[in-house]
Interface confidence: medium
């Protein structure tokens, strides 16, 4: 299953990055799982994951740094709280969980660049 | 003549970006000219240029946004005052001016990403 995502995204100076993850669904899935993986120096870690029913809202865990919305075969992902050390390749993994058959698709990754802001001068 | 430069550089939150432009000199040049070109949407503009004698300091014009130092066949370039709208591909062009023969080398470009900082809260 083909998954498309942008090649490069710049995080805002507040450490927020948003990108769209779009998948070409081969069937009529009702339950979809989206996982964001981060790769840096060949280390792969799971950033966040959400399972949603088509037409419903994505629900990440309360303490997740991700939020998102879905529209058809598109998922709009936002990652917050990013710092310069979080710069890396963020890969969108989409799984069609239900009904069978199970389908899996993995995007080529979005390189997210993060620059730490200069601290503001003291206001005292 | 081969010219090497990094593929990607992030400007600091103060709008400063630095990168090294390295050239493989086929001869013993004494006078070298370095030009930084910016390409965005197939438009190419000259950002800055400097001619220097090997072993001496690079001298850009007083109102130039570039500064630099040289060491052997390496030129360390710094571009200041960058804003988000200046994001683009910055190409290093090196010319060996003297003695003959003249040599020209052009790098593949360094993609410089610039993020405008959030304004600091008023201190009044």
């Amino acid at each position: 299953m083909h998954v498309a995502q942008p090649a490069v995204v710049l995080a805002s100076s507040r450490g927020i990055a948003s990108f769209v993850c779009e998948y070409a669904s081969p069937g009529k899935a009702t339950e979809v799982r989206v996982t964001v993986l981060r790769q840096a120096d060949s280390q792969v870690t799971e950033v966040c994951a959400a399972t949603y029913m088509m037409g419903n809202e994505l629900t990440f865990l309360d303490d997740s740094i991700c939020t998102g919305t879905s529209s058809g075969n598109q998922v709009n992902l936002t990652i917050q709280g990013l710092r310069a050390m979080d710069t890396g390749l963020y890969i969108c993994k989409v799984e069609l969980m239900y009904p069978p058959p199970y389908y899996l698709g993995i995007g080529n990754g979005t390189q997210i660049y993060v620059i730490d802001p200069e601290p503001c001068p003291d206001s005292d | 003549m081969h010219v090497a430069q990094p593929a990607v550089v992030l400007a600091s939150s103060r709008g400063i970006a630095s990168f090294v432009c390295e050239y493989a000199s086929p001869g013993k040049a004494t006078e070298v000219r370095v030009t930084v070109l910016r390409q965005a949407d197939s438009q190419v503009t000259e950002v800055c240029a400097a001619t220097y004698m090997m072993g001496n300091e690079l001298t850009f014009l007083d109102d130039s946004i570039c500064t630099g130092t040289s060491s052997g066949n390496q030129v360390n370039l710094t571009i200041q005052g960058l804003r988000a709208m200046d994001t683009g591909l910055y190409i290093c062009k090196v010319e060996l001016m003297y003695p003959p023969p003249y040599y020209l080398g052009i790098g593949n470009g360094t993609q410089i990403y610039v993020i405008d900082p959030e304004p600091c809260p008023d201190s009044d």
Epitope: H2, L37, Q39, Q43, V44, E95, P101, G105, I106 | -
Partner: nanobody, 126 residues
Framework: QVQLQESGGGSVQAGGSLRLSCAAS????????MGWFRQAAGKEREGVAA???????SYADSVKGRFTISQDNAKNTLYLQMNSLEPEDTAMYYC????????????????????WGQGTQVTVSS
């Protein structure tokens, strides 16, 4: 539905060889990666080797020069030739598959794979 079935595991002396096979069925992707992973008792599952549809391969540093991954597309079978086996290679070996070529080119992480076999045990004694 994709199904993977490993075979070829067993017990061998250090320095010996084994050849693992993985029969794949129900696979319809035009581009894909397949890989071998292993999990020793009490340890996390780790990547051993992966190969994508154009034959590009990647190996874990610990097996480079000793293990070779290959595939026979006509038979829908994945192989892992293991030579110069060491006691540290003792583990359950799993065959895995994923859509796209990404996993073989970049990182041998189980997070990139979604289809798994049941595993075959390899034991290397000194």
């Amino acid at each position: 539905q994709v199904q993977l079935q490993e075979s070829g595991g067993g017990s061998v002396q250090a320095g010996g060889s084994l050849r693992l096979s993985c029969a794949a069925s129900g696979y319809t992707y035009s581009s894909y990666s397949m890989g071998w992973f292993r999990q020793a008792a009490g340890k996390e599952r780790e990547g051993v080797a992966a190969i994508d549809s154009d034959g590009s391969t990647s190996y874990a540093d610990s097996v480079k020069g000793r293990f070779t991954i290959s595939q026979d597309n006509a038979k829908n079978t994945l192989y892992l030739q293991m030579n110069s086996l060491e006691p540290e290679d003792t583990a359950m070996y799993y065959c895995a598959a994923t859509a796209g070529w990404y996993a073989a080119r970049h990182a041998l992480s189980p997070l990139f794979f979604g289809y798994w076999g049941q595993g075959t045990q390899v034991t290397v004694s000194s």
